[in-house]
């Protein structure tokens, strides 16, 4: 039985030219971490795979750094990167649990973080 | 179009070292990672491990650790495969490959540097 | 380590078969599963990842299916190219891993 639960960082806006840390956090279970896969929408970002490193898709390695821890740095932001992020956890013995971040990039200086909050997971079995 | 050219075909004493370089040409070289595969006479292809070029850090098979060391010179587009203390068993094909856009799997390989390990 | 098996070892085929090649993982890696083909003296080329994609430049009669621990890759119907050793190889963990090839010829 999954137990876990996805921890995200929420709602979250920023400016234009700015950057974010993109962020979850896996807690409620023991299961081991494997992989974290980033993605926008439907387009991989980036991987984290405990025993191999850090993937970054070549279309963002200019402007995606990897961490803090399993998080991700979003750097350089375009009004383009407002939308939805998802983290991917694969787990053992678990499967995976998907948080969802909703990131919006503003014009002006009124760009403020929204509240940590925590999501419904989803996840399916393997 | 892109291309990962190898240097020649090594002949090579038990116990001595062996680099292959592995030059990219046709995409930008640090935006992806680089993978080293190395293929004995008709085995299974084995990983050795992989290197981000634009910071350098690698990652490595468990069994090659102690004697595999990867580099990369960026200004040269060229990543670098050395083995140390090298015996019989290292007789084999080495392949230099491109890390795909997706994971780690690897999309344009080079063609391969044969490297002989006799007395 | 992640180990990966493969059947048929070997198959003999005609042009315009259908080929199916079977790759069995130790251990669920989810869809990180790709497949190479490689014709003698030649380098490895790249036919799936994902355990479904197919790569750029792959004629449309190759596919990939499964995921978790079974995988299959299928030649809808042969032509006398795809005649080589294929290689199925997980993309999930360290080290990376291959299988020991699947060796499609002539009948």
């Known amino acids: 039985m999954m137990t876990g639960t996805i921890e995200t960082t929420g709602n979250i806006s920023a400016e234009k030219g700015g950057s974010i840390i993109l962020q979850c956090h896996l807690s409620s279970t023991t299961a081991q971490v494997t992989q974290v896969n980033w993605e926008q929408q439907d387009q991989l970002l980036a991987i984290c795979n405990a025993d191999l490193g850090w993937h970054i898709s070549p279309s963002f390695k200019d402007r995606v750094a990897p961490g803090p821890g399993l998080g991700l740095t979003l750097q350089s932001l375009t009004v383009n990167d407002t939308g939805e992020y998802f983290c991917i956890y694969h787990t053992y013995p678990d499967g995976t649990y998907t948080g969802r971040i909703f990131l919006e990039v503003l014009e002006s200086s009124v760009a403020e973080h929204g509240a940590r909050f925590q999501i419904p997971h989803h996840h399916h079995h393997h | 179009e892109v291309q990962l050219v190898q240097s020649g075909a090594e002949v090579k004493k038990p116990g001595a070292s062996v680099k292959v370089s592995c030059k990219a040409s046709?995409?930008?070289?640090?935006?992806?990672?680089m993978h080293w595969v190395r293929q004995a006479p008709g085995q299974r292809l084995e990983w050795m491990g992989r290197?981000?070029?634009?910071?350098?850090?690698?990652k490595y098979n468990e069994k090659f650790k102690s004697r595999v060391t990867i580099t990369v010179d960026k200004s040269a587009s060229t990543a670098y495969m050395e083995l140390s203390s090298l015996r019989s068993e290292d007789t084999a094909v080495y392949y230099c490959?491109?890390?795909?856009?997706?994971?780690?799997?690897?999309?344009?390989w080079g063609q391969g540097t044969t490297v002989t390990v006799s007395s | 380590d992640i180990q990966m098996t493969q059947s048929p070892s070997s198959l003999s085929a005609s042009v315009g078969d259908r080929v199916t090649i079977t790759c069995r993982v130790s251990?669920?890696?989810?869809?990180?599963l790709a497949w190479y083909q490689q014709k003698p003296g030649k380098s490895p080329k790249l036919l799936i990842y994902?355990?479904?994609t197919l790569a750029e430049g792959v004629p449309s009669r190759f596919s990939g299916s499964g995921s978790g621990t079974d995988f299959t890759l299928t030649i809808s119907s042969l032509q006398p190219e795809d005649f080589a050793t294929y290689y199925c190889q997980h993309h999930y963990g360290n080290p990376l891993t291959f299988g020991p090839g699947t060796k499609v010829d002539i009948k």
């Open positions: 290197i981000d070029p634009d910071s350098g850090g690698s």
């Open positions: 251990e669920n890696i989810y869809s990180y």
């Open positions: 490959a491109r890390e795909g856009h997706y994971g780690f799997y690897s999309d344009y």
């Open positions: 994902n355990a479904k």
């Open positions: 046709g995409y930008t070289f640090t935006n992806y990672y």
